[in-house]
Amino acid sequence: ALDTNYCFRNLEENCCVRPLYIDFRQDLGWKWVHEPKGYYANFCSGPCPYLRSADTTHSTVLGLYNTLNPEASASPCCVPQDLEPLTILYYVGRTPKVEQLSNMVVKSCKCS
Amino acid sequence: ALDTNYCFRNLEENCCVRPLYIDFRQDLGWKWVHEPKGYYANFCSGPCPYLRSADTTHSTVLGLYNTLNPEASASPCCVPQDLEPLTILYYVGRTPKVEQLSNMVVKSCKCS
């Protein structure tokens, strides 16, 4: 699986999850998030050669088409597969609130 | 929606579905498919500027990160959203068989 366990341990050029730390204030301008100050959102990147973690029949067909037609511009793209939520702390005035934000952290990638 | 109705009618540089005709024999080497000879598989391509048909909170966050950090290499990618099946005719010996292949035709795209 093209997940953090594999991708963070290997120098993988092809489609894989890559570490990306986002600081809420500096990178997003979100002053309202109190904790954490930032988090590893991660992202997916890298080429999608034929059959690499193909998501659907279409991505398999497109990968094969690319292999047999190297000049083609149509190819699958490396995108998030599994995402996890992030728990944040923010304040409503002086009152602390805890919220779980869905689909905030990429754990694995696929070729789609 | 970034679907064939919109994308095929407009000269859209950003993420959109593009027409791609695949000939089973010539492009894939699939001699076993009798009918059709080929089909419009289509594909997704084009940049994913901030908020263009963002798929998840992560892709929105990543798009915002990119907007505020233009030198960043992490950005959402244009990939299939809605796929449709394709019905094919093939032969087992002299016996014709009809099969529906799932997820063969891209009808719309998203930024993921």
Epitope: W30, K31, W32, Y90, G93, R94, E99 | V61, L64, T67
Partner: antibody
Framework: QVLLVQSGADVRKPGASVKIFCKAS????????MHWVRQTPAQGFEWMGS????????TYARRFQGRLVLTADTSTNTAYMELRSLKSADTAVYYC?????????????WGQGSLVTVSS | EIQMTQSPSSLSASPGDRVTITCRAS???????LAWYQQKPGKVPKLLIY???SRAPGVPSRFSGSGSGTDFTLTISSLEPEDAATYYC?????????FGQGTKLEIK
């Protein structure tokens, strides 16, 4: 420059709903919290609630809970305020306002206001 | 709900005068959860002061804010004719945000 442009005046019957939009430009809409405040001669300013774009976290004043829905569409940089089960006491000028950054905060930019008249 | 009480409800002063408007909260706001706004007839409110004492960008230096706990003041050091307006305080320490009833300032 920062601009918040609201929908025009509206007349509604008691029991109906009203939906007002607030289109933002000149800043990163998704980075700031949007508030809704109304003003009447009798009650002065009343804070209704706030919404955080992207994550759609809404905070409501208790007196509006259950009949107020605040949303934000980040694809169009537009915030929406829907108030249901209108009463004549809901006749007011409704403002959207951007905060300095926190969920409850001072409001540095305001829309031009939308007059809603509730009358049978 | 925190009640905000402004005084006076109206006042009249001459250009060059020093004017003070007070705002009292029914509970302590700490030192930084108070804002002041100016509203002219038919216009939208304009933020003057936030965090009890920080001037908003573009606000003339004659406007200043002070106070903490329950008692806050807005001071206009030298009144100008264009300062004729209604002034409101607003607390954002607790939900719901609440406003004072306003102080109408007339220029003689």
């Amino acid at each position: 420059q920062v601009l918040l442009v609201q929908s025009g005046a509206d007349v509604r019957k008691p029991g109906a709903s009203v939906k007002i939009f607030c289109k933002a430009s000149g800043y990163t809409f998704s980075s700031n919290v949007m508030h809704w405040v109304r003003q009447t001669p009798a009650q002065g300013f009343e804070w209704m609630g706030s919404v955080i774009p992207i994550v759609d976290i809404a905070t409501y004043a208790r007196r509006f809970q259950g009949r107020l829905v605040l949303t934000a569409d980040t694809s169009t940089n537009t915030a929406y305020m829907e108030l249901r089960s209108l009463k004549s006491a809901d006749t007011a000028v409704y403002y959207c306002a951007r905060t300095l950054g926190l969920v409850l905060d001072a409001m540095d930019y305001w829309g031009q206001g939308s007059l809603v008249t509730v009358s049978s | 709900e925190i009640q905000m009480t402004q005084s006076p409800s109206s006042l009249s002063a001459s250009p060059g005068d020093r004017v003070t408007i007070t705002c009292r909260a029914s509970q302590s706001l700490g030192s930084s959860y108070l804002a002041w706004y100016q509203q002219k007839p038919g216009k939208v409110p304009k933020l003057l002061i936030y965090g009890a004492s920080s001037r908003a960008p573009g606000v003339p230096s004659r406007f200043s804010g002070s106070g903490s706990g329950t008692d806050f003041t807005l001071t206009i050091s030298s009144l100008e004719p264009e300062d004729a307006a209604t002034y409101y305080c607003q607390q954002y320490a607790d939900s719901p945000i609440t406003f004072g009833q306003g102080t109408k300032l007339e220029i003689k």
